[in-house]
């Protein structure tokens, strides 16, 4: 269908105003410009009210090279003020003036809410010559609309240096409605009431909402957007949406799963990353967190030993990261290890479990009996010690570490000595005369070094001194031993 | 965002004239209709007539039509009304509008008071 | 002109309660594309008007869904489902269909 509408040549065309003369356009071509020389260019819109001059920007053309008459004013004739179409339909719309032949150089230019519409858009003028004017018609069509489109159009023609506006003509694109919020996907306890929301807007309004659980509709009324919908509590995962109806047609929101929290699945693949004669440091992987966020994880330690009472160690911490580092252990133990994790609707079932040892430890008692006396012939300082009586998880012996501290008139020298497993006495050389040698032993094993002994002093005299009183460790409470020559 | 800012409240003698204003800001003045209306103290709304800022032609009311005049400004976009010959029927709270693109004075200057006295 | 006759002048509610104003117009607002235009709007005391529906039915981006309108030709309404305290003030209908544009002489919502 062609919509046409024809209007006489006047030298003030009348101006009825912006009356919304609007063209739906759905299934109509706007614009049929067939030119005849006995009237103007078809317009889109007939006006039916009673108009009036146009009064404001217009062109005033100069006098004629005759001289002999003014020609009227140039102005836009009025078109359409308003269309309303829906999203994705075709729309054209159009200028029309007509400019007296002595004019040259005239070119109109679409302008969309202050900004020049230049490139991608199909703007064509089309020029009607007469014998003293010319019937100038700008057309501009949009295929397939869009929201960004709403705007409001005007024509503009330069003309011999003056700028003739058109009065504009408004689009309005309607579509189907547009969410403006959509239902969350959300985790909810069982059997508790919940909300989900679902808001859209047209144009045009208003906008109608059915909200849809597991593919049918839950409410037979349709409420207006926005809609909260109280679901009274769920006993199994569902699936909502909601419909947004408007006069254009219907929009669905995405489809959001509603799930129900329960408790975690246990964890999995425990892993033994590091052990230490009394420390294990383990990782995990979570189990699925039943739709609710974990809150903190059990680390559970049992003592593998057929003599042990059996008893089970419970260590808390946070569920992230899924590590911890088990301490207070026995070294040279064998245990067994287990992971369990919460969230707000309880605990989880224990991981598989699994085996882990710590290693030796270091000793926990120093070498009995220490004592040292000088050996002036050798200058040497003999140092003799009992073997402490270590537990079976320090495991085996390997050696001894000896520490001799030299001092002498403000100066501190410490040394280190290592021997072997078998031996219970040394000799160190004699590092300075008249001076005081400090002697602590520990026990090695492969878990670590040990407690050192209780120090014991010797004096070093000057050279030609003799004493072959040894030193010794002190009985417990007694001062630090101190050989006086 | 769309704003219409009218200036502030007139008192004047009769037989004199006013010019009020409204600044528009927060879209192209010059791309949309703006419209006057009239609110006598108590009463309703009076439509005066309206300026399309982009090429100032105008419309009036016919009741209007020698009382008002409708002027734009469009380097401040600013619109302006003059009232003329001023009586005591002219006190009122005088506003200005868009048209919006919905074709409806969707936003509203907040008024301008003008009191006719001797 | 187009003369808008607004019923009723005065309208007292309770709070929660439906209110509806009434528009009658002296000419049919019905375009010769098919559209209405026919708006209503809320004056607050002390404030401009503000736009509530538009175009008959449409509801103005913001204004809650407690407001709907309807009507067609010569006839039209605006109902407020459960009235609240910030809705109190003049209701105005207005129609630019015709010039000069008219407004109805208001319907001021008050508590009962």
């Known amino acids: 269908a062609i919509t046409e509408a024809r209007e006489e040549a006047k030298p003030y065309p009348l101006f009825p105003g912006p009356l919304p003369g609007s063209l739906q356009t759905d299934h109509t071509s706007l614009l049929s410009l067939p030119h005849t020389s006995g009237y103007q260019p078809a317009l889109m819109f007939s006006p039916t009210q009673p108009g009036r001059p146009y009064t404001g920007n217009v062109a005033i053309p100069r006098v004629t090279s005759a001289g002999s008459k003014l020609l009227p004013p140039l102005a836009f004739k009025h078109t359409v003020g308003h269309i309303i179409l829906s999203e994705h339909k075709d729309v054209k719309f159009n200028c029309s003036i007509s400019v007296p032949n002595i004019y040259q150089d005239t070119t109109i230019s679409w302008w969309k809410d202050g900004k020049e519409l230049l490139g991608a858009h199909h703007a064509i003028t089309q020029f009607y010559p007469d014998d003293e004017v010319t019937a100038i018609i700008a057309s501009f069509s949009i295929t397939s609309v869009q929201r960004s489109d709403n705007g409001s159009y005007i024509c503009k023609m330069k003309i011999n240096n003056e700028e003739i506006v058109s009065d504009p003509i408004y689009i309005e694109v309607q579509g189907l409605p547009h969410f403006t919020k959509q239902p969350e996907s959300m985790n909810v306890t069982r059997n508790t009431a919940f909300n989900l929301t679902c808001q859209a807007v047209g144009p045009p309004e208003p906008v109608n909402i059915f909200w849809v659980q597991n593919s049918s509709r839950v409410n037979e009324q349709p409420e207006k957007s926005p809609s909260v919908l109280t679901v009274p509590g769920l006993t199994e995962m569902a699936v909502f949406s909601c419909e947004a109806h408007n006069d254009k047609g219907l929009t669905v929101s995405k489809g959001v799963q509603i799930n129900i929290k329960a408790i975690p699945s246990p964890p999995t693949e425990v892993s033994i990353h590091n052990s230490t004669a009394h420390s294990i440091l383990i990782s995990w992987v979570p189990g699925f967190d039943g739709y609710s966020p974990f809150r903190n994880c059990s680390v559970q330690v049992k003592e593998v030993d057929p003599l042990s009472n059996g008893s089970v160690m419970i260590f808390n911490t946070s569920a992230s990261p899924h590590m911890y580092q088990i301490k207070q252990l026995q070294a040279l133990a064998n245990y067994s290890i287990g992971v369990s994790c919460m969230n707000e609707i309880g605990w989880s079932a224990v991981s598989p479990w699994i085996l882990a040892s710590t290693t030796e430890g270091a000793p926990s008692v120093a070498p009995l009996n220490v004592t040292v006396f000088l050996n002036e012939s050798r200058d040497n300082v003999d140092i003799r010690w009992m073997k402490p009586l270590t537990k079976r998880q320090a495991g085996e012996l390997v050696g001894y570490r000896i520490s001799h501290v030299w001092q002498s008139a403000g100066i501190s020298k410490e040394l280190l000595e290592e021997v072997g497993q078998n031996n219970s006495r040394a000799q160190i050389s004699v590092q300075v005369h008249n001076a005081t040698c400090t002697v602590r032993i520990a026990a090695v094993t492969k878990g670590g070094v040990g407690p050192f002994s209780d120090p014991v002093k010797i004096f070093i005299p000057a050279h030609g001194w003799v004493d072959h009183a040894p030193s010794s460790t002190p009985a417990p409470g007694n001062a630090d031993p101190v050989l006086i020559i | 965002q769309v704003q219409l800012q009218q200036s502030g409240p007139e008192l004047v003698k009769p037989g004199t004239s006013v010019k009020i204003s409204c600044k528009a800001s927060?879209?192209?003045?010059?791309?949309?209709?703006i419209h006057w209306v009239k609110q006598r103290p108590g009463q309703g709304l009076d439509w005066i007539g309206w300026?399309?800022?982009?090429?100032?032609?105008?419309q009036y009311n016919e009741k209007f039509k020698g009382k008002a005049t409708l002027t734009a400004d469009t380097s401040s976009s600013t619109a302006y009304m003059q009232l003329s010959s001023l009586t005591s029927e002219d006190s009122a709270v005088y506003y200005c509008?868009?048209?919006?693109?919905?074709?409806?004075?969707?936003?509203w200057g907040q008024g301008t008071s003008v009191t006719v006295s001797s | 002109d187009a003369v808008m006759t607004q019923t009723p002048l005065s309208l007292p509610v309770s709070l929660g309660d439906q209110a509806s104003i009434s528009c009658r117009s002296s000419?049919?607002?019905?375009?010769?594309?098919?559209?209405?235009?026919l708006h209503w709007y809320l004056q607050k005391p002390g404030q401009s008007p503000q736009l509530l529906i538009y175009?008959?039915?449409n509801r103005f981006s913001g204004v809650q869904d407690r407001f709907s309108g309807s009507g067609s030709g010569t006839d039209f309404t605006l109902k407020i489902s459960r009235v609240e305290a910030e809705d109190l003030g003049v209701y105005f209908c207005l129609q630019v269909t015709h010039v000069p544009f008219t407004f109805g002489s208001g319907t001021k919502l008050e508590i009962k």
């Open positions: 175009r008959v039915s």
């Open positions: 509008a868009r048209l919006g693109l919905i074709y409806a004075l969707d936003y």
């Open positions: 927060g879209y192209s003045f010059t791309s949309y209709y």
């Open positions: 300026i399309f800022p982009g090429n100032r032609n105008t």
């Open positions: 000419q049919s607002l019905e375009n010769s594309n098919g559209h209405t235009y």
